[in-house]
Interface confidence: low
């Protein structure tokens, strides 16, 4: 009896959904694999006979419910097959948005980049498949633990009247209001205001 | 340290109007989001309304429930955020709270709580 693949699991961010598993133990030999998702009340192959304990799902459609299977393979052996559902738009992970910090004196002018999605057009991003989509912008001085927090109304955001020659760090995320859901927070970028630019009588 | 005091509860009747005031101290940016959630009793805790002053103008989010009849508002020189509340229903009756960081409407994430304002629709 080949036993079934073990921890299978979804991992999707920005859309590119990888199925993943691990290899069970197995006395006899190395193990193949074969994926396949449900396409009009039938099963299709995506990924046949394969070693690896991956397949890229990334073609199907973002909307709606898939239902995904995989099993474990030896000779002509196979395990019962394991099934997970997955909905792109409702389960994938909204990865760190890009951003685009410059300084100009006491202000910080900040751009964001929606995260593009994969096989799509080179302009596609998660902003087009979400239409709520907005930013979460927070902010603090270096070396300080309190935070402040704002929902920008655009791509781009200026922060004003800051302490001249301090060190302020900010990082952004895509934020979902209608779904109250978050995606991942950037890595914080951190750039030091000059002088105001106020000029001494 | 931040702290949050609300005042402008009280009794009204189904259909009347309220306008809750949160004074803030202890604020060192105006970026800060701030709103107020409420807790009916038996209930837990839920965001009503949130703003986010930024370089440009302000957002503000609503939940559903109080779309169109609450108005969230904020005065920055007086370090003030209001919640004006218009065509009020029994089930809005709840202890009011402020809060600063309101990401997420529908879970009461915030890291500074006010002691709250109690707010009672009934005829």
């Known amino acids: 009896m080949v036993p079934p693949p073990e921890n299978v699991r979804m991992n999707s961010v920005n859309f590119k959904n990888i199925l993943q598993w691990e290899s069970p133990a197995f006395a006899k030999g190395n193990l193949t694999f074969t994926a396949q998702y449900l396409s009009y009340r039938i099963f299709q192959d995506k990924c046949m006979n394969t070693t690896l304990t991956e397949c890229d799902f990334s073609s199907l459609s973002k909307y709606g419910d898939h239902t995904l299977r995989v099993r474990a393979e030896f000779a002509d052996e196979h395990s019962d097959w394991v099934n997970i559902t997955f909905c792109p738009v409702d389960d994938t992970i909204i990865g760190p948005p890009g951003m685009q910090v410059e300084v100009l004196a006491d202000s910080l002018h900040m751009r964001f980049l929606a995260p593009k999605i994969e096989n799509e057009y080179e302009t596609w991003t998660m902003k087009n498949v979400y239409n709520s989509w907005t930013y979460n912008v927070q902010y603090w001085k270096n070396g300080t633990d309190e935070k402040f927090q704002i929902t920008p109304q655009y791509d781009f955001e200026v922060l004003r009247n800051l302490e001249p020659w301090t060190t302020y760090c900010v990082q952004v995320r895509g934020f979902l209001p209608d779904r109250n859901k978050a995606g991942e927070w950037s890595e914080p970028v951190c750039e030091q205001t000059t002088h105001d630019e106020t000029v001494p009588s | 340290e931040v702290q949050l005091v609300e005042s402008g509860g009280g009794l009204v009747q189904p259909g009347g109007s309220l306008r809750l005031s949160c004074s803030a101290s202890g604020f060192t940016s105006p970026y800060s989001t701030i709103g107020w959630f409420r807790q009916a009793p038996g209930k837990g805790r839920e965001g009503v309304a949130c703003i986010s002053s930024s370089g440009r103008g302000v957002n503000a989010n609503y939940i559903d429930s109080v779309r169109g009849r609450f108005t969230i508002s904020r005065d920055n020189s007086k370090n003030t955020v209001y919640l004006q509340m218009n065509s009020l229903r029994a089930e809005d009756t709840a202890v009011y709270y402020c809060?600063?960081?309101?990401?997420?409407?529908?879970?009461?994430?915030?890291?500074?709580w006010g002691q709250g304002t109690m707010v009672t629709v009934s005829s």
């Open positions: 809060a600063t960081n309101c990401w997420r409407l529908t879970s009461p994430a915030a890291d500074n």
